[in-house]
Interface confidence: low
């Protein structure tokens, strides 16, 4: 069972349902309308924003656009058909794909990634497919909070 519990707090971005708890014994607590998985919290948007707008929204929630640790990180979203902005963009300065925190993309995460013609920002879906798009395109997005 994934470590998860819902926390009865009201996040800044919405007057979300004030859900009562039967608190699990495990380690994770997530705001309402956030999803807990493997001791991380994810906000999976239903609205669309540009990559920068998405990044700013996540920052306002004390989180960041999703930085994938491995390709199965979004297994819990297997039923979703949508592409979502993640925290990966192309740095002209470094001629490399960098995560929001400045770290480089692992060659093992997307083995065929070098065949992409960079369009600056990356959208990702739960099937493990990555799509490079103009950062001004509006997509859904995923924010991630690491709890431990």
């Amino acid at each position: 069972k994934n470590s998860f519990t819902k926390l009865s707090v009201e996040p800044a971005y919405t007057p979300g349902p004030n859900i009562e708890l039967q608190k699990d014994s495990d380690c994770c607590s997530c705001h309402e309308k956030w999803v807990g998985y493997r001791c991380n919290c994810y906000f999976i948007s239903s609205e669309e924003k540009t990559w920068n707008e998405s990044r700013h929204f996540c920052a306002s929630q004390k989180s960041s656009l999703l930085q994938l640790q491995n390709r199965d990180e979004l297994d819990f979203m297997s039923s979703s058909q949508h592409f979502y902005w993640i925290g990966l963009s192309y740095s002209e300065e470094h001629t490399a794909w960098l995560w929001e925190n400045g770290s480089a993309l692992s060659q093992y995460l997307f083995p065929s990634f070098e065949t992409f013609k960079p369009k600056n920002c990356i959208a990702y879906n739960s099937k493990g497919n990555a799509l490079d798009e103009s950062c001004e395109t509006k997509n859904r997005y995923i924010c991630k909070q690491q709890l431990i």
Partner: antibody
């Protein structure tokens, strides 16, 4: 695609406990992006949310019914259940189970077929 | 709890006409509002979530608008199968609540 199949008695005696079960097919009840809920509708009236449950067992209930409601989940059987104790004629209604996504929408998107429950001696 | 008031209680229109249904919340629910359609003997069907996003498979003649406390469901051109009862539901604050419904009937 996901479907919800309800089962349980259609007649319950006053003061007894109403018990209904909702079986999820075409998907896993253990998906972490869904809550599962119960809603009821008295004859000729509107909808009333009863409560919801997460696969981990976390629940939240309508305060107006909280003292009498227990919702439980059995992940091994891919089903969740409603128990409503000390029923009266006012609990006569069609009871629905439904899925509540956590992917931004947070609105009941898939419903069971409904079970008409009559409280009568 | 947040009370949702729907108006009118009954709306009588003819096929091909435009229907406008209103839902007013007793306090702000942001855009956490959904609309459902229910036909006799059937379970409700989700039409709109997030005040304005159409659910999967819902025809584009259905549209939702509004935020805060005032919301509208519009059916641009009524089809015979659209005559039913419509409910709004808020999920911005617990407990989740529904409006009392608007019956859309054939004139």
């Amino acid at each position: 695609q996901v479907q919800l199949q309800q089962s349980g008695p259609g007649l319950v005696k006053p003061s007894e406990t109403l018990s209904l079960t909702c079986t999820v097919s075409g998907g896993s009840i253990s998906s972490i992006i869904y809550y599962w809920g119960w809603i009821r509708q008295p004859p000729g009236k509107g909808l009333e949310w009863i409560g919801s449950i997460y696969y981990s067992g976390s629940t939240y209930y309508n305060p107006s019914l909280k003292s009498r409601v227990t919702i439980s989940v059995d992940t091994s059987k891919n089903q969740f259940s409603l128990n409503l104790s000390s029923v009266t004629a006012a609990d006569t209604a069609v009871y629905y189970c439904a899925r509540l996504p956590l992917t931004g929408e947070f609105a009941f998107d898939i419903w069971g077929q409904g079970t008409m429950v009559t409280v009568s001696s | 709890e947040i009370v949702l008031t729907q108006s009118p209680a009954t709306l009588s229109l003819s096929p091909g006409e435009r229907a406008t249904l209103s839902c007013r919340a007793s306090q702000s629910v942001s855009t956490y509002l959904a609309w459902f359609q229910q036909k006799p003997g059937q379970a409700p069907r989700l039409l709109i979530y997030g005040a304005s996003s159409r659910a999967t498979g819902i025809p584009d003649r259905f549209s939702g608008s509004g935020s805060g406390t005032d919301f509208t469901l519009t059916i641009s051109r009524l089809e015979p199968e659209d005559f039913a009862v419509y409910y709004c539901q808020q999920y911005g604050s617990s407990p989740i609540t529904f409006g009392q419904g608007t019956r859309l009937e054939i004139k």
